[in-house]
Amino acid sequence: MASSGMADSANHLPFFFGNITREEAEDYLVQGGMSDGLYLLRQSRNYLGGFALSVAHGRKAHHYTIERELNGTYAIAGGRTHASPADLCHYHSQESDGLVCLLKKPFNRPQGVQPKTGPFEDLKENLIREYVKQTWNLQGQALEQAIISQKPQLEKLIATTAHEKMPWFHGKISREESEQIVLIGSKTNGKFLIRARDNNGSYALCLLHEGKVLHYRIDKDKTGKLSIPEGKKFDTLWQLVEHYSYKADGLLRVLTVPCQKIGTQGNVNFGGRPQLPGSHPATWSAGGIISRIKSYSFPKPGHRKSSPAQGNRQESTVSFNPYEPELAPWAADKGPQREALPMDTEVYESPYADPEEIRPKEVYLDRKLLTLEDKELGSGNFGTVKKGYYQMKKVVKTVAVKILKNEANDPALKDELLAEANVMQQLDNPYIVRMIGICEAESWMLVMEMAELGPLNKYLQQNRHVKDKNIIELVHQVSMGMKYLEESNFVHRDLAARNVLLVTQHYAKISDFGLSKALRADENYYKAQTHGKWPVKWYAPECINYYKFSSKSDVWSFGVLMWEAFSYGQKPYRGMKGSEVTAMLEKGERMGCPAGCPREMYDLMNLCWTYDVENRPGFAAVELRLRNYYYDVVN
């Protein structure tokens, strides 16, 4: 999808022109003199994330589709794979290997010309924002965090289902009904709609030409590509529509005016393109059909949207018309259609995000409202953790309850627990385990959000099948949570894979702020008063040497956490004593790259293990680097 990932892989190339048409590419090559081997790269208009290579030879332009493989490599059909479009072009400058000739001279974009963004690119940001806002009813920081953390998944979701929001897509209606709808209202040649034919991903394009409605079948092949019979193949319906709004290419005529669903007002903005002979006024706008869309409305998750009505042309070809598919297309019904996203879970937003749930002024909770299960989930420094249920004003919330050891009535420990509670109650971020409150009953209890799958290190030890893409996604989420802590002037001090809990295989939360202390805004570190039990292998040198803890020392710990994650939960510095680890670090040595870990991720670990705290990046930089790599890999 010409997403940030795709654009990054080619935008920097001076001979990459973006989303230009085949004809435009040919015009550029003519401008460049059409010498043999003159070439340029453009974005594929029918394959998500793909490219097209346009090469001059024998005074003619030859075009090759470059597809993006599932593993993120690039290849011309039947050719060898390459890590990037640039690598592919470099290879073909030395080997023709199926091309009409060697690539000899790139035709670079003229001065001031930027790669052209596709029509969907302009729409995508808005579509994603609206989709997230309305599907999960998010706003503010929760909305921003959702978009950042799930952008690749959301882009894919939007790209492959965007047609369901388009005014020309009428869902599953009969051939007869589609004809009648097309014939309601203006009779512009090229007026069209697309309807779903069956549940196997087959569609029909209904096109008005000289008062008659023509039906073209759109089939999906085994790889999911869409095409009219004998026609060009596309990844998405909106790409197909965009293509046929530029050229007929097998249809009787180009697509001009989308036949809107009855009762869907103001979805299309026409105007801007020169009037075409014989076309309806207000037909065209710069950039084809897609770029005319200017508003969207998304159904709420799990809600059926009732359908609107349509029109009849038997005795009248009037102008009346409302419609919408029977089941709201993007009503993320949380059914089997897709893997659950973090936003689908109950712990993405604070339980107090619901205005009807009043956040108690006190950190203390009523013990009578808390029910505990017998089974222990685990045990930690403070005691055991059990699953429980807390009766809130509106809902019963599944919670994890830390039960303090009875002998821990030691005032110092009690203070530590209260400190943890006060710290945690101030924190509210999707990638942090939120604290609901504390109970003083048979024991002290800390009531927190539930993360069913448990610690990251244990999960990865038991689930070696988890792909590195998935691990990148999870560590990116941890970096987002830590960036939030850094912005909130909180130092974690015990960041490790054991303190990252999984809600789902694709959703991580940072837990255990047992050693956290709120920084005063004007301080960037504080000195630990006593040694205690220190997790030295996760500590930055300045913590060990000078007891100085800061968000920068959390960055060091994050590097170790990354190493644990890519090692599938192995213990860091295996078999070494704390003193040996310290000596190793002083010598400038670091842990090796885990088997199968991407080089970029190991480079980032090493950056986190920068000895000098001043030169070590903060979480803002770490998160951005992870984000960019994550987008690139997932796309």
């Epitope: 009849n312 009037v318 018309n321």
Partner: antibody, heavy 115, light 110 residues
Framework: QVQLQESGPGLVKPSDTLSLTCAVS?????????WGWIRQPPGKGLEWIGY???????YYNPSLKSRVTISVDKSKNQFSLKLSSVTAADTAVYYC????????WGQGTLVTVSS | QSVLTQPPSASGTPGQRVTISCSGS????????VYWYQQLPGTAPKLLIY???QRPSGVPDRFSGSKSGTSASLAISGLRSEDEADYYC???????????FGGGTKLTVL
């Protein structure tokens, strides 16, 4: 000759659901593709509420969409309108009609929303 | 506020010819058919003109419709007292994707 006849309660309480039925005679409901509802508040103009296609697809006025449901019962040769959460502003004469262009109309039924 | 604009009232004497106008925009009247309905006092509307100028059977030829650009008009010649009624124009609106009506014109036969 097609005839349409609206029926339903003439008085509905605020916040309740208004329910009307349009019985079609002299014509099979499956023979004409579009059936519609229109309303006219006292002393005011006409407002389109929605259509139902004989197959059951429904199309509504966006301003009423969240509250309207139109359904068809082919066995009884009738179609119905439900309008939820009514207020005094929904007081009107409600008409059912045939065809997109409203070629034939029922005689209308006055529905008053009042407690 | 109606999408199509009609004068609120019109009048004429028996035998006279009166015209009722209806103005819209390119997305409705400009690109689609116009319909006219007659509503006699205390009765339901009745289709008078469809597809700009077509009369359903039973409608006298004294009633005629025309359209030009984004406006349409209904002409009634040989005005009779039984023509006293409200008259509504309607058209399909492509941008609203729905039928739209005029506010209605009350015709008084003096």
């Amino acid at each position: 000759q097609v005839q349409l006849q609206e029926s339903g309660p003439g008085l509905v309480k605020p916040s309740d659901t208004l329910s009307l039925t349009c019985a079609v005679s002299g014509y099979s409901i499956s023979s004409s593709n579009w059936w519609g509802w229109i309303r006219q508040p006292p002393g005011k103009g006409l407002e389109w509420i929605g259509y139902i296609y004989h197959s059951g697809s429904t199309y509504y006025n966006p301003s009423l969409k969240s509250r309207v449901t139109i359904s068809v019962d082919k066995s009884k040769n009738q179609f119905s309108l439900k309008l939820s959460s009514v207020t005094a502003a929904d007081t009107a004469v409600y008409y059912c009609a045939r065809n997109v262009g409203f070629h034939d109309w029922g005689q209308g039924t006055l529905v008053t929303v009042s407690s | 506020q109606s999408v199509l604009t009609q004068p609120p009232s019109a009048s004429g004497t028996p035998g006279q010819r009166v015209t009722i106008s209806c103005s819209g925009s390119s997305s409705n009247i400009g690109s689609n058919y116009v319909y006219w309905y007659q509503q006699l006092p205390g009765t339901a509307p009745k289709l008078l003109i469809y597809r700009n100028n077509q009369r359903p059977s039973g409608v006298p030829d004294r009633f005629s419709g025309s359209k030009s650009g984004t406006s349409a008009s209904l002409a009634i010649s040989g005005l009779r007292s039984e023509d006293e009624a409200d008259y509504y124009c309607a058209a399909w609106d492509d941008s609203l994707a729905s039928p739209v009506f005029g506010g209605g014109t009350k015709l008084t036969v003096l």
